[in-house]
């Protein structure tokens, strides 16, 4: 029961996290104009991974996409890549974890298969969360660097009394959404990995040893450890007594649930 709950909760937390990562990636407010001493501004600038926007006091908002690929900073490209990798891994992880859920029965899928799928999805969620956190952190670092650089050049004299006020950018809402979402995906992944251990029982799987005696010929089949994972319970230790002698090939083998050739 606890395993099912842990797995289910891990799935839900990861689902929320990945939805958050997608939302953060699509959001325009990765960086917003720093208003420092002026909380009300006539022109407010904010930027996302895909476009930059300007909101005027009039209420008019204009967004322009970055219609260049080569002209964009390498860091921005790296952040985009990390977020997309995070989304793709997360989406695959969600797909895998749906089939791995203990509460959902699909055909005659064994617990070990579900355990493996749970572990796989858990790892995917962890990597997805780390990608998102890394992407957001790289962008945040870029902002901090640019912020202090533009603060140093805050007012550039243009001769006489003319001044150019440089626009400084600070953390936008998308960064916080990304950090939280990445964290949730990471937590969900860890929960899936924990659930995986519970899904796979501890007993070592010993296969039955079959003796077939007929007169003096004894057919002995040591079938015990063929590709066994060591997880799962196979307590069907069957001894087969048959009056007739068999060749080794004729001796029945009872494969474990975990025999993968």
């Amino acid at each position: 029961m606890a395993v099912t709950a842990c797995q289910g909760l891990g799935f839900v937390v990861s689902l929320i996290g990945i939805a958050g990562i997608i939302a953060a990636t699509c959001m325009d407010q990765w960086s917003t104009q720093d208003l420092y001493n002026n909380p009300v501004t006539a022109v407010f600038n904010y930027q996302g991974l895909w476009r930059s926007c300007v909101r005027e006091s009039s209420g008019f908002t204009e967004c322009r996409g970055y219609f260049t690929l080569l002209g964009l900073p390498a860091m921005l490209q790296a952040v985009r890549a990390l977020m997309i990798v995070g989304i793709v891994l997360g989406a695959i992880g969600l797909l895998v974890s749906i089939f791995a859920l203990k509460c959902i029965r699909i055909g005659s899928m064994e617990d070990s298969a579900k355990a493996n799928m749970t572990l796989t999805s858990g790892i995917m969620f962890i990597v997805s969360g780390l990608c998102a956190i890394a992407g957001v952190s790289v962008f945040a670092n870029m902002l901090v660097t640019n912020f202090w650089m533009s603060t140093a050049n805050m007012y550039t004299g243009m001769g006489g009394m003319v001044q150019t006020v440089q626009t400084r950018y600070t953390f936008g809402a998308a960064l916080f959404v990304g950090w939280v979402a990445g964290g949730l995906t990471l937590i969900g992944g860890v929960m899936m990995c924990i659930a995986c251990r519970g899904l796979a029982p501890e007993e070592t799987n010993y296969k039955a040893v079959s003796y077939h005696a007929s007169g003096h010929s004894v057919a002995y089949k040591p079938g015990g450890f063929k590709a066994s994972t060591g997880f799962g319970s196979n307590t069907k230790n069957k001894k087969i007594y048959d009056g007739g002698a068999r060749t080794e090939d004729e001796v029945q083998s009872y494969p474990s649930k975990h025999d993968y050739v």
Epitope: V43, N45, V54, S58, F60, T164, T167
Partner: antibody
Amino acid sequence: DVQLQESGPDLVKPSQSLSLTCTVTGYSITSGYNWHWIRQFPGNKMEWMGYIHYTGSTNYNPSLRSRISITRDTSKNQFFLQLNSVTTDDTATYYCTRIYNGNSFPYWGQGTSVTVSS
Amino acid sequence: DIVMTQSPSSLTVTPGEKVTMTCKSSQSLFNSGNQKNYLTWYQQRPGQPPKMLIYWASTRESGVPDRFTGSGSGTDFTLTISSVQAEDLAVFYCQNAYSFPYTFGGGTKLEIK
């Protein structure tokens, strides 16, 4: 089309309060945009005074902040200017306007001339 | 506050002539976010409220004759009337639309001979 019309007293005594009304037709003041007051002094110099946002929030010119108040009556689709402790320097033509793209003012009332004199 | 300085303060021209008036701001009105200059030009005929001609420094308001052209960037802006008409007798103002408080230039009075 949006139309604005100012109304109020022509003459105000120094140290008193000046109260003006702007009646808007053709657009609801709660639907969008900022609704501004701008005044023009006798020498043609113009001064932006402040605005009320369609949500009800306000923003004023720092030079007037201590004595200005812009409010509204949504049921009558009107917004108001109150300027306290007036002096003869407040003698001007007062315009109500609505902002548009580029933070520009394409919509103006006809203006109301106010003289501050004892 | 951004100070707007207009020149000349007045000029007299004959109909059909080309007119240029300038507006300088104490700070740049250019916004890098959308590559636009936040400057507006108004025309005020005698006894009337101002009428907006140009916004974003060079975008003509609908219904404004194409003889009015706005140009410039940063701190230096120009309003050009390619062929002055008698009805152009007015005072022309520029406005800082970039930061609060919005400020206006002192105006350029256009008189017709």
